[in-house]
Interface confidence: medium
Amino acid sequence: FGISGKHFITVTTFTSAGNIGEDGTLSCTFEPDIKLNGIVIQWLKEGIKGLVHEFKEGKDDLSQQHEMFRGRTAVFADQVVVGNASLRLKNVQLTDAGTYTCYIRTSKGKGNANLEYKTGAFSMPEINV
């Protein structure tokens, strides 16, 4: 799901799943502004007051982060310049499942996209030889 148009930028997300107890990734991409100080990335979760994660002015700003995500989130800071706003989520919990919004603001405009994040005890299928 994505938004584009005048004063909006295109943001793209991908539905993904996370294994409980492991690390997961919520994928989000956008056309990057080459000016890193002009980029703001916000991750929000439906039903949660406060932010999942915020990256702005070239660094993380966790002042408004919800306590359930404290110490468990990170963006790929070196890849923001090439349009990667994906969020790394450590130690995935069952309660992490839900609808997330990846919100991007740059000097050109803003945009957002939603993704459904599923959690569970997933495992690789057995391969019988």
């Epitope: 080459i34 000016k35 002009g38 070239g58 660094k59 800071a77 890849q79 310049v81």
Partner: antibody, heavy 116, light 107 residues
């Protein structure tokens, strides 16, 4: 092999025009922003212009704003720099560079000489 | 515009020496500071990105540190191929700006 190859440099009179090209290979060109950087003889490096992956963001140094135009054709894996109203102070080696974490891939450069 | 000031402008050293080059930004650039090496007649080569991250393929004798406004490039043990000019560059905002360069020469 990841590679950038500039072309189009040469001798031009003040007030003249040139178009530089930068052919990219060995990587997904359409995923990366690109820069032009120049170096006058015996001097340091000077950033000239930048363009984002889909051309949505374009920036210029004040010294070239209104005279130079950066563009790209992702279908041809090529970056361009159209240079108009050239001045003696534009004489330099012009490099294209890939925008990643730093300017991580550079071309070999093409020389532009502005002289009457 | 953000001004980048390198020191020293030139430096004489011997093979095996430990060398430090500093770069100061006129305002904060967080950790968006890159270091390049350039040899005569060649294109610059990225050594360090984001202040302290070693670019792939660059020898581990090169290291970078700092954040905000003050940054350092260190070569732990100079090798003959390290004699070149070194530039810092901020990639925090446009106009991107380079330091004036530090020429590292053989003593």
């Amino acid at each position: 092999e990841v590679q950038l190859l500039e072309s189009g440099g040469g001798l031009v009179q003040p007030g003249g025009s040139l178009r530089l090209s930068c052919a990219a290979s060995g990587f997904t060109f359409s995923s990366y922003g690109m820069h032009w950087v120049r170096q006058a003889p015996g001097k340091g490096l000077e950033w000239v212009a930048s363009i984002s992956s889909s051309s949505g963001y374009i920036y210029y140094a004040d010294s070239v704003k209104g005279r130079f135009t950066i563009s790209r054709d992702n279908s041809k894996n090529t970056l361009y720099l159209q240079m108009n109203s050239l001045r003696a102070e534009d004489t330099a080696v012009y490099y294209c560079a890939r925008a990643s974490s730093g300017m991580d891939v550079w071309g070999q450069g093409t020389t532009v000489t502005v002289s009457s | 515009d953000i001004q980048m000031t390198q020191s020293p402008s030139s430096l004489s050293a011997s093979v095996g020496d430990r060398v430090t080059i500093t770069c100061r930004a006129s305002q904060t650039i967080r950790s968006y500071l890159n270091w390049y090496q350039q040899k005569p007649g060649k294109a610059p080569k990225l050594l360090i990105y984001a202040a302290s991250h070693l670019q792939s393929g660059v020898p581990s004798r090169f290291s970078g540190s700092g954040s905000g406004t003050d940054f350092t490039l260190t070569i732990s043990s100079l090798q003959p191929e390290d004699f070149a000019t070194y530039y810092c560059q901020q990639s925090y905002t446009t106009p991107y700006t380079f330091g004036q360069g530090t020429k590292l020469e053989i003593k």
